[in-house]
């Protein structure tokens, strides 16, 4: 069945049941996600605007899918398996009486079950499993996933230590001078350099030692966290930001309307689901898109891919690859490639690495 092909997943609570305080709803949903993040490499982040991977909805009767709710009792909730659009979304029947305790229907316990579906789990035949199809109240203070639940979710995503580069469980700001720090995306924006990581970005103003950390949502509330690639076309005052199979256009530091759009509008084949890194070279007026161990070259004037691509990164960028995390263009002759906690200054005229640095070397660490 389907799974999320990433470990950083956003959710949004679309609306709130009047049965509970908003804070109690937020807490129940957060704790329910935490149940699954505790046993997997997955990390969940709540967003308040924009498109989340998982939308949490309280609704009654017919509510915008093929599966109308049935009034009090019976079907309590349903959730869609991972995917775009409605994929991953969890719907709770507003005709139930949602509670924080054993009376009515416990929101936390129901949400744990539904989020299991949102992550790709089916029902379990083990009556002790939270993924067993029928609702049964258990003490939420001592609640634990069954061995069957853990086996199921870890068969899809692995165990928690399988991805050390994920954001901190509490989503706190990563330590800037951590020698293992890596970045999701890096780009110039005028005379500044933006370094993206999880839901944060650092701003480095050229030649100044001081850097500042910011939430992506504080600058661009409609953008998601976990930006995966970015590039700038300075002459047009444009910045392109990528996440999964979508991209956003920022003009003069303002998000353009009618975005996100599909990365496939650039001409990528269907199998490309995300961009690892991107960089625009104003000398050639070409953008290089890095995907796994390959790269594409896009003609920004003709708005189409150059023929003969993709090519292997290792074949054409000596010493770089096979995969990269981020890249940006600087000083009219260098690409700065980021791979994990390492960074390579690459002279594209000489076509070789001229310096090896730590990824956070820009911050005076």
């Amino acid at each position: 069945g389907p799974v999320w092909r990433k470990h950083y997943i956003t959710y949004r609570i679309n609306n709130y049941t009047p049965d509970m305080n908003r804070e109690d709803v937020d807490y129940a949903i957060r704790k329910a996600f935490q149940v699954w993040s505790n046993v997997t490499p997955l990390k969940f982040s709540k967003i308040n605007t924009g498109m989340a991977d998982i939308l949490v909805v309280f609704a009654r009767g017919a509510h915008g899918d093929f599966h109308a709710f049935d009034g009090k009792g019976g079907i309590l909730a349903h959730a869609f398996g991972p995917g775009s659009g409605i994929g991953g979304d969890a719907h709770f029947d507003e005709d139930e009486f949602w509670t924080t305790h054993s009376g009515g229907t416990n929101l936390f316990l129901t949400a744990v079950h539904e989020i299991g579906h949102s992550l790709g789990l089916g029902h379990s035949s083990d009556p002790k499993a939270v993924m067993f199809p029928t609702y049964k109240y258990v003490d939420i203070n001592t609640f634990r996933l069954s061995a069957d639940d853990i086996r199921g979710i870890q068969s899809l995503y692995g165990d928690p230590k399988e991805n050390q580069r994920l954001p901190n469980p509490d989503n706190s700001e990563p330590a800037l001078c951590d020698p293992n720090l890596s970045f999701d995306a890096v780009t110039t924006v005028g005379n500044k350099i933006f370094f993206f990581k999880d839901r944060f970005f650092w701003l480095k103003v050229s030649e100044r030692p001081k850097t500042s950390v910011n939430l992506i949502s504080s600058l661009w509330p409609t953008l998601p966290s976990g930006i995966e690639a970015a590039y700038e076309i300075e002459a047009r005052n444009q910045v392109f930001l990528f996440k999964d199979d979508k991209y956003w256009l920022i003009s003069n530091l303002r998000p353009e309307p009618n975005y996100p759009k599909s990365i496939h509008s650039f001409g990528f084949p269907n199998f490309v689901k995300k961009i690892d890194a991107a960089v625009f070279n104003p000398r050639f007026y070409r953008t290089y898109f890095f995907v796994d161990n390959q790269y594409w070259r896009y003609d920004e004037r003709r708005q189409m891919m150059d023929p003969g691509y993709p090519k292997l990164i290792t074949k054409n960028f000596q010493g770089i690859g096979p995969k990269i995390d981020a890249v940006f263009y600087s000083k009219n002759k260098y690409y700065y490639f980021f791979q994990g906690s390492n960074q390579f200054e690459y002279d594209f005229l000489l076509q070789r690495i001229t310096k090896t640095l730590k990824s956070n070397s820009w911050f005076g660490c």
Partner: antibody, heavy 122, light 103 residues
Framework: EVQLLESGGGLVQPGGSLRLSCAAS????????MHWVRQAPGKGLEWVSG????????IYADSVKGRFTISRDNSKNTLYLQMNSLRAEDTAVYYC???????????????WGRGTLVTVSS | DIQMTQSPSSLSASVGDRVTITCRAN??????LNWYQQKPGKAPELLIY???SLQSGVPSRFSGSGSGTDFTLTISSLQPEDFATYYC?????FGQGTKLEIK
């Protein structure tokens, strides 16, 4: 490449029966919800019926409930629509359409067949 | 029951024009709205899903927006091949269609 090919359409008298088939290829048929959507001549699109990947859950538009039966044979990669007690207003091109996989239908039809024409007339 | 109202039912425009088609639901459908294009004698093709996501292979001149009850499909610069009928859809309910014709 995903392909859906409908067959079984034709001319039938009111009250008669017809069975439509949709042969699927280019994807793992047994993972996906499948649907029938119809279009009367010169009119808009009307959803008819859907079936879960396993075949265990079926859903119908009110206009066909009790008369039409959707089914599938995953071993043959084929979707069916058994149409009984046909009426003149059932005259339409019938399309089969692919949905996403999962226990619930997304209502997102990403691939469609070319359609087969059913004419109900005396 | 949920109903979808699409407008206009027909529209005349010229190549290069910017065109907007709207779809309204009688209750919130969140972002669960899709747009399809259908050319005469052909099957419908998915253009936009989840209100604003462009289906793979669809040109970027097509865009969708909206959430809740009000949705729009925009074609930023009409091309000759865009003259067709457009449908909004949410689960088992389709809008009545908008026929886009050459002026």
């Amino acid at each position: 490449e995903v392909q859906l090919l409908e067959s079984g359409g034709g001319l039938v008298q009111p009250g008669g029966s017809l069975r439509l088939s949709c042969a699927a290829s280019g994807f793992t048929f047994s993972w996906y919800w499948m649907h029938w959507v119809r279009q009367a001549p010169g009119k808009g699109l009307e959803w008819v019926s859907g079936i879960v990947s396993s075949g265990g859950t079926t859903i119908y538009a009110d206009s066909v409930k009790g008369r039409f039966t959707i089914s599938r044979d995953n071993s043959k990669n084929t979707l069916y629509l058994q149409m009984n007690s046909l009426r003149a207003e059932d005259t339409a091109v019938y399309y089969c359409a692919k949905d996403i996989r999962g226990p619930y239908s997304s209502g997102l039809f990403d691939y469609w067949g070319r359609g087969t024409l059913v004419t109900v007339s005396s | 029951d949920i109903q979808m109202t699409q407008s206009p039912s027909s529209l005349s425009a010229s190549v290069g024009d910017r065109v907007t088609i709207t779809c309204r639901a009688n209750q919130s459908i969140y972002t669960y709205l899709n747009w399809y294009q259908q050319k005469p004698g052909k099957a419908p093709e998915l253009l936009i899903y989840a209100a604003s996501s462009l289906q793979s292979g669809v040109p970027s001149r097509f865009s969708g927006s909206g959430s809740g009850t009000d949705f729009t499909l925009t074609i930023s610069s009409l091309q000759p091949e865009d003259f067709a009928t457009y449908y909004c859809q949410q689960a088992g309910i389709f809008g009545q269609g908008t026929k886009l014709e050459i002026k």
